[in-house]
Interface confidence: medium
Amino acid sequence: CCSCQEKWVGYRCNCYFISSEQKTWNESRHLCASQKSSLLQLQNTDELDFMSSSQQFYWIGLSYSEEHTAWLWENGSALSQYLFPSFETFNTKNCIAYNPNGNALDESCEDKNRYICKQQLI
Amino acid sequence: CGHCPEEWITYSNSCYYIGKERRTWEESLLACTSKNSSLLSIDNEEEMKFLSIISPSSWIGVFRNSSHHPWVTMNGLAFKHEIKDSDNAELNCAVLQVNRLKSAQCGSSIIYHCKHKL
């Protein structure tokens, strides 16, 4: 079920682009969109266990919606309260960077981080 | 996915088993053989950079018989790239460590990865 484009990683029927270049959250979002993908939306914290020993943090597709007063993924679905137990302490003006060992932190969206794009192959 | 075993990753026409267990170099070699694959070989610099993003450290299929012998790959070819700490006579197996190739004691317990080409 997996046939990923060049430079993308295939794992469990998803394709991931793992950047080594640092971008702002918005720049990262646009770069993923230009590759017909979106910033990483996590199903669970094991999703990237193939790189769980990485020490880097990566922008993911999570942002705070004032309208819904909730953290939402790019597709509009809400963040599960079980994914990041510390999410209530996140500054709602910030964006979320994720480390594949399961940690997340909030940072200014204008900060530059690496990013991960995801394409689902069904 | 595709032609790779379940729980392996695909990248650039190869399948990779990203191990989390630590083994000696020789144990890693045997573990990969049992998975019908080879201990991680790095064919080019771009592959090395990719693997360094995925995993900070792992054994690679490069070794030497002693510090007086050249570094060779599993198919017996000379390995021409710089391997750090090569002047230490006790370090005769090679490790990928965050974009670097280093020598290490073959009996050390280090994470291993396996690879096979599609």
Partner: antibody, heavy 118, light 107 residues
């Protein structure tokens, strides 16, 4: 002996274009990432652009993105930097530099001076 | 981009002195730091990579240390040929960045 020789620098008007070349010898050019680094008169070093061994990965500094294009011809052992829409602040000595499989810049050329002035 | 701040910007020292130059990164870069020496009119020369690994052929009086955000280049006993400008560089992620340089002058 590793050698990198830059050429193509000179005086150009703002808005103009220039193409720098870097001729490599003494090593397997196609195995190495290459970079351009510049240094404005009396100032520090500024990284400009990088290209991986097979041109799969290309990176630019924000200050040149959209104006400069890095490329390479492995058959000719040559690295290039196409510079368009040049500005006064692009005035600098431009160096090409080699990476050794993820090591930082272990060999540099002697540099070529680019002057952007009306 | 990751910013590197070197200190001091310049320093005067004598032959035989022990000299230390520091480099601070705006975010953690593990040990992905290099040090270069540059003399007027010449290309930079790699001294240290991986924060503490000495490039072959570089005199052992040069040493590097540090990890994360704080790094140090030490010259244990200055020689006349060591008077130059020194730069740190991070290669943890793109864009690659250099420190602003430290000019080492004869006292």
């Amino acid at each position: 002996e590793v050698q990198l020789v830059e050429s193509g620098g000179g005086l150009v008007k703002p808005g103009g274009s220039l193409r720098l070349s870097c001729a490599a010898s003494g090593f397997t050019f196609s195995s190495h990432s290459m970079n351009w680094v510049r240094q404005a008169p009396g100032k520090g070093l500024e990284w400009v652009s990088a290209i991986s061994s097979s041109s799969s990965y290309i990176y630019y500094a924000d200050s040149v993105k959209g104006r400069f294009t890095i490329s390479r011809d492995n058959a000719k052992n040559s690295l290039y930097l196409q510079m368009n829409s040049l500005r006064a602040e692009d005035t600098a000595v431009y160096y090409c530099a080699r990476e050794e499989w993820g090591l930082p810049f272990d060999y540099w050329g002697q540099g070529t001076l680019v002057t952007v002035s009306s | 981009a990751i910013q590197l701040t070197q200190s001091p910007s310049s320093l005067s020292a004598s032959v035989g002195d022990r000299v230390t130059i520091t480099c601070r990164a705006s975010q953690g870069i593990s040990s992905a730091l290099a040090w270069y020496q540059q003399k007027p009119g010449k290309a930079p020369k790699l001294l240290i990579y991986d924060a503490s690994s000495l490039k072959s052929g570089v005199p052992s009086r040069f040493s590097g240390s540090g990890s994360g955000t704080d790094f140090t280049l030490t010259i244990s006993s200055l020689q006349p040929e060591d008077f130059a400008t020194y730069y740190c560089q991070q290669f943890n992620s793109y864009p690659l960045t250099f420190g602003q340089g430290t000019r080492l002058e004869i006292k």
